[in-house]
Interface confidence: medium
């Protein structure tokens, strides 16, 4: 599923991401835009043999199990395929664990490079939330 900007903002708010660990909703929508272009089925392979999955591009080396990443920790205790569902519950729950891990949203490279320090509220402007 490819979400609309405001559709995703509403879904993320429903799942409790607004101000989760101090990160406003705009940060999460911005991260999703530049990680996956709002596509729940996005997959991207990394040079270390791991793969990033879903709307927030969650990595199989640490957070989920795709059955083929050497040394996978699966800290979210889920199959990576669950992160590709049109229902973003699994991605959100795992993202909450990631953002609580100490580095905050710096765990997402796209957020660090494209969203951090910018007017992230622009990503939810005009949305009826």
């Amino acid at each position: 599923k490819v979400f609309g900007r405001c559709e995703l903002a509403a879904a993320m708010k429903r799942h409790g991401l607004d101000n989760y660990r101090g990160y406003s909703l705009g940060n999460w929508v911005c991260a999703a835009k530049f990680e996956s272009n709002f596509n729940t089925q996005a997959t991207n392979r990394n040079t270390d043999g791991s793969t990033d999955y879903g709307i927030l591009q969650i990595n199989s080396r640490w957070w989920c199990n795709d059955g083929r990443t050497p040394g996978s920790r699966n800290l979210c205790n889920i199959p990576c395929s669950a992160l590709l569902s049109s229902d973003i519950t699994a991605s959100v729950n795992c993202a909450k664990k990631i953002v609580s891990d100490g580095n905050g949203m710096n765990a997402w490279v796209a957020w660090r490079n494209r969203c951090k320090g910018t007017d992230v509220q622009a990503w939810i402007r005009g949305c009826r939330l």
């Epitope: 089925q41 043999g49 059955g67 083929r68 590709l84």
Partner: antibody, heavy 115, light 107 residues
Framework: QVQLQESGAEVMKPGASVKISCKAT????????IEWVKQRPGHGLEWIGE????????YYNEKFKGKATFTADTSSNTAYMQLSSLTSEDSAVYYC?????????WGQGTTLTVS | DIELTQSPATLSVTPGDSVSLSCRAS??????LHWYQQKSHESPRLLIK???QSMSGIPSRFSGSGSGTDFTLSINSVETEDFGMYFC?????????FGGGTKLEIK
């Protein structure tokens, strides 16, 4: 137990297309990548690409882009590979395998003859 | 693409001999190297995963070693059922690649 059952041997004319199937049983089909491998005598084993059935995400070896197309039907736990514009170079045994980095589970192979 | 070169192409041995098969990668692949045995008209069978981890049901005479670019499959005291083709495969990067194979034949 995990099993991958491939469709039977095919004899095709040059220029035609063929669709090979791989039915998976004994595990959660949507969770694991299905890989496709080509074997020709004297050419060893070649990785064609892969599909994640749960999402339809696919990756292809550059060499096989435009030649192979992967699909999956999660209702029947079956993965498919279509090969188009067949030539004699496509005559080979084609295997599906479950993608665990390594390949522990293999189909029995489908022999394709183009002549 | 990572190229895997296996040597020798053919190895002629007598049952009871011990042998070593080599697989060399064109660049470092850490320990992401797997070994398969294939007999005529059969699917490949996984012997060793991640360089040295033996699969259950595989006889203990098969062992693997190496790291980086140089890997070895050793068969301690070859038995008649061991004859066939042996392939290595890397899972360090895409596309996945296989070695050209070593044929183990009876002398």
């Amino acid at each position: 137990q995990v099993q991958l059952q491939e469709s039977g041997a095919e004899v095709m004319k040059p220029g035609a297309s063929v669709k090979i199937s791989c039915k998976a049983t004994g595990y959660t089909f949507t969770t694991y990548w299905i890989e496709w491998v080509k074997q020709r005598p004297g050419h060893g084993l070649e990785w064609i690409g892969e599909i994640l059935p749960g999402s339809g995400s696919t990756y292809y070896n550059e060499k096989f882009k435009g030649k192979a197309t992967f699909t999956a039907d999660t209702s029947s736990n079956t993965a498919y590979m279509q090969l188009s514009s067949l030539t004699s170079e496509d005559s080979a045994v084609y295997y599906c395998a479950r993608g665990d980095g390594y390949y522990y589970y293999w189909g029995q192979g489908t022999t394709l003859t183009v002549s | 693409d990572i190229e895997l070169t296996q040597s020798p192409a053919t190895l002629s041995v007598t049952p009871g001999d011990s042998v070593s098969l080599s697989c060399r990668a064109s660049q470092s692949i850490s320990n992401n190297l797997h070994w398969y045995q294939q007999k005529s008209h059969e699917s490949p069978r996984l012997l060793i995963k991640y360089t040295s981890q033996s699969m259950s049901g595989i006889p203990s005479r098969f062992s693997g070693s190496g790291s980086g670019t140089d890997f070895t499959l050793s068969i301690n005291s070859v038995e008649t059922e061991d004859f066939g083709m042996y392939f290595c495969q890397q899972s360090n990067s895409w596309p996945r690649t296989f070695g050209g194979g070593t044929k183990l034949e009876i002398k």
